[in-house]
Interface confidence: medium
């Protein structure tokens, strides 16, 4: 099986239908279509999925039937191109339909929109949701897949099936509970938060593959799997990396049926070979398929083997370093990364990749030098500052987080990042800075040994959100530079940015700082976002404002909202007190 399976099947669509089963087949085709055509109504997608499913069944019955030998891209692309409103709804994406495969699929991929113009998902009343769930469970769950997939066009499809299974379980349990809301809402909140995190993590994997190539993704995978499975042999880790790369390449490329099928195969292989991979897999491997795959992906690091020899022996002291490097560069560097990562679960993956890059650069130079050994003898000394930089950064920021709490820590980051890249849109700065700020509550609680992998790898995910959002409408050369030059140095690149002295402050617009009584009915989170939006705008108007000035204005603003939300005539209060606040803020900031 594996890479060569395709040759053995006359009909790819029949093969995948049989492998996956009808339910998963339909769900994955729906996800694929929704991720490509993000604006199409639900009913249109369901119709297309049903047509594809009926066709797949004819191919299962007779693999030689007409068109059954066509590739999945051809079949799915032809189906998408039958959508009548393609030109009106998607504009130039309709031009993709004039192309042949594989160019047509590449064209569809390029038109995936990370920030589609879709209304925010508003959660109906619990009773309304439970009624809809009971009336038509299948449609209800399909709608969930559709709404998530169209808003997250790179969501890891087999994992979305796992989320849908949990979503269904939550409704099955809670719609029978005495207090439906108390049972259901926390579960839905958890699924929403986990879903956003899962989407962002997968988006980084796809960006890594698409923008930096397979080699970059494989390097990431070697480091991560070596940390997770330190007892596994290098050959075993290499095999897992190859298979995992294939799975993610397929999912990121829109080949969702192949991806889900190959992910299932990989989970099966891992469980069949867990003795040579990790002692932590036992529980995962007893679970059903979707839970099993999810569990393996999240499994804790195995214990490091005792008495691992010093790395210096093979990678610095050996007289065969240059010989080994020359004979198979990527294998030798892969071994270095494997050996370093399995010894350092306390390092972030991106740090390990920076160390490997430093080692590679040193060998590239020294193995062509007069005296190679003398040249690379002190290479490990070059690692020290690379290790200390994130350690110090995390220490400082965790201290700041503990001192300020999450909301104010987010505000500090909002100010910091707005000053670095003030050209970026306010909603993007708010979203990204809020997520950056969550690193505090997510990671600072951990002991020293777990802080860096938690924090820096999480920051890589969040900064990738900034990069993909910025790529859609580029406005800052500094963001472009940090996003495109090096995947592993994105965080240090952004950290090193100082205040953008070239930025011309935004004209003051009183409308931006005009608030209404509707703010009083918002949830605490939404109210925070409103205040943080105002903070970003303030910094854009007055980039040289001091922390103290901004704090004073924000404190006044919080008091103003609190006061007016308690007033009898809220709207009048917001109008009158708002004018005073704007005037006072202008004076305080010298606008």
């Amino acid at each position: 099986r594996g890479v060569f399976r395709r040759d053995a099947h006359k009909s790819e669509v029949a093969h995948r239908f049989k492998d996956l089963g009808e339910e998963n087949f339909k769900a994955l085709v729906l996800i694929a279509f929704a991720q490509y055509l993000q604006q199409c109504p639900f009913e249109d997608h369901v119709k297309l999925v049903n047509e594809v499913t009926e066709f797949a069944k004819t191919c299962v019955a007779d693999e030689s039937a007409e068109n059954c030998d066509k590739s999945l891209h051809t079949l799915f692309g032809d189906k998408l191109c039958t959508v009548a409103t393609l030109r009106e709804t998607y504009g130039e994406m309709a031009d993709c339909c004039a192309k042949q495969e594989p160019e047509r699929n590449e064209c569809f991929l390029q038109h995936k929109d990370d920030n589609p113009n879709l209304p925010r998902l508003v959660r109906p009343e619990v009773d309304v949701m439970c009624t809809a769930f009971h009336d038509n469970e299948e449609t209800f769950l399909k709608k969930y897949l559709y709404e998530i997939a169209r808003r997250h066009p790179y969501f890891y499809a087999p994992e979305l099936l796992f989320f849908a299974k949990r979503y269904k379980a939550a409704f099955t349990e809670c719609c029978q509970a005495a207090d439906k809301a108390a049972c259901l809402l926390p579960k839905l909140d958890e699924l929403r938060d986990e879903g956003k995190a899962s989407s962002a993590k997968q988006r980084l994997k796809c960006a890594s593959l698409q923008k930096f190539g397979e080699r970059a993704f494989k390097a990431w995978a070697v480091a991560r799997l070596s940390q997770r499975f330190p007892k596994a042999e290098f050959a075993e880790v290499s095999k897992l990396v190859t298979d995992l790369t294939k799975v993610h390449t397929e999912c990121c490329h829109g080949d969702l049926l192949e991806c889900a099928d190959d992910r299932a195969d990989l989970a099966k292989y891992i469980c069949e070979n867990q003795d040579s991979i990790s002692s932590k897999l036992k529980e995962c491997c007893e679970k059903p398929l979707l839970e099993k795959s999810h569990c393996i992906a999240e499994v804790e690091n195995d214990e490091m083997p005792a008495d691992l020899p010093s790395l210096a022996a093979d990678f610095v002291e050996s007289k065969d370093v240059c010989k080994n490097y020359a004979e198979a560069k990527d294998v030798f560097l892969g071994m270095f990364l494997y050996e370093y990562a399995r010894r350092h679960p306390d390092y972030s993956v991106v740090l390990l990749l920076r160390l490997a890059k430093t080692y590679e650069t040193t060998l590239e130079k020294c193995c062509a030098a007069a005296d190679p050994h003398e040249c690379y003898a002190k290479v490990f000394d070059e690692f020290k500052p690379l290790v200390e930089e994130p350690q110090n950064l995390i220490k400082q920021n965790c201290e700041l987080f503990e001192q300020l709490g999450e909301y104010k820590f987010q505000n500090a980051l909002l100010v910091r990042y707005t000053k670095k890249v003030p050209q970026v849109s306010t909603p993007t700065l708010v979203e990204v800075s809020r997520n950056l700020g969550k690193v505090g509550s997510k990671c600072c609680k951990h002991p020293e040994a777990k802080r860096m992998p938690c924090a820096e790898d999480y920051l890589s995910v969040v900064l990738n959100q900034l990069c993909v959002l910025h790529e859609k409408t580029p406005v800052s050369d500094r963001v472009t530079k940090c996003c495109t030059e090096s995947l592993v140095n994105r965080r240090p690149c952004f950290s090193a940015l100082e205040v953008d002295e070239t930025y011309v402050p935004k004209e003051f617009n009183a409308e931006t700082f005009t608030f209404h009584a509707d703010i009083c009915t918002l949830s605490e989170k939404e109210r925070q976002i409103k205040k943080q939006t105002a903070l970003v705008e303030l910094v854009k108007h007055k980039p040289k404002a001091t922390k103290e000035q901004l704090k004073a204005v924000m404190d006044d603003f919080a008091a103003f909202v609190e006061k007016c939300c308690k007033a009898d005539d809220k709207e009048t209060c917001f109008a009158e007190e708002g004018k005073k606040l704007v005037a006072a803020s202008q004076a305080a900031l010298g606008l």
Partner: antibody
Framework: EVQLVQSGAEVKKPGESLKISCKGS????????IAWVRQMPGKGLEWMGI????????RYSPSFEGQVTISADKSISTAYLQWSSLKASDTAMYYC????????????WGQGTLVTVSS | QSALTQPASVSGSPGQSITISCSGI?????????VSWYQQYPGKAPKLIIY???KRPSGVSNRFSGSKSGNTASLTISGLQADDEAEYSC???????????FGGGTQLTVL
């Protein structure tokens, strides 16, 4: 096609300064060492020193340390050999060579620059 | 930093084999196989003919071969031809921090 092109012959007086050049093309200039080699009239070859243009790391043979300066400008893929005060004994043919491979070997050479120092 | 020692000249008739020795290879250079041989015609730039003791760059005739025993490296040219007449220099490393050293060169004459 890998090429190293050196600047033309020079005739100088003792005490004068001089900078000769070696421009690389057809390969990644920043990722290979460049060596300078001296050959005095009727004599053998002598390694003078090497430079890695990627980071300007420079090493000199003991007998040339302090006598010459090796530098590089990676933006124009050019390495240099310079003297601040020439002596008659500096009269020689000077070659640049790209050092390449697992251990350095001069696999491509410039055509040579003849430097004559005479009063 | 002493130069490597080579014979000043060797000669041979067409079709014969000759060997040029190069003594004084440091143990470091020996362990890393850091020995190269260059051919140079009068008025021309040197040309690499052997590197890492025994390896030939592409385009170099297999009549040229290299070997090493102890602290001495050797270049053997079999089936001598008239156009092999040239100066041959070995090169290696003198030790830590040294750039490299050449031997004094050997003039090969084809009789």
């Amino acid at each position: 096609e890998v090429q190293l092109v050196q600047s033309g012959a020079e005739v100088k007086k003792p005490g004068e300064s001089l900078k000769i050049s070696c421009k690389g093309s057809g390969y990644s200039f920043t990722r290979s060492w460049i060596a300078w080699v001296r050959q005095m009239p009727g004599k053998g070859l002598e390694w003078m020193g090497i430079i890695y243009p990627g980071d300007s790391d420079t090493r000199y043979s003991p007998s040339f340390e302090g006598q010459v300066t090796i530098s590089a400008d990676k933006s124009i893929s050019t390495a240099y050999l310079q003297w601040s005060s020439l002596k008659a004994s500096d009269t020689a043919m000077y070659y640049c060579a790209r050092l390449h491979g697992v251990v350095s070997r001069g696999d491509y050479w410039g055509q040579g620059t003849l430097v004559t120092v005479s009063s | 930093q002493s130069a490597l020692t080579q014979p000043a000249s060797v000669s041979g008739s067409p079709g014969q084999s000759i060997t040029i020795s190069c003594s004084g290879i440091s143990s470091l250079a020996g362990s890393y196989n850091l020995v190269s041989w260059y051919q140079q015609y009068p008025g021309k730039a040197p040309k690499l003919i052997i590197y890492e003791v025994t390896k030939r760059p592409s385009g170099v005739s297999n009549r040229f071969s290299g070997s090493k025993s102890g602290n001495t490296a050797s270049l053997t040219i079999s089936g001598l031809q008239a156009d092999d007449e040239a100066e041959y220099s070995c090169s290696s490393y003198a030790g830590r921090n040294a750039v490299a050293v050449f031997g004094g060169g050997t003039q090969l004459t084809v009789l």
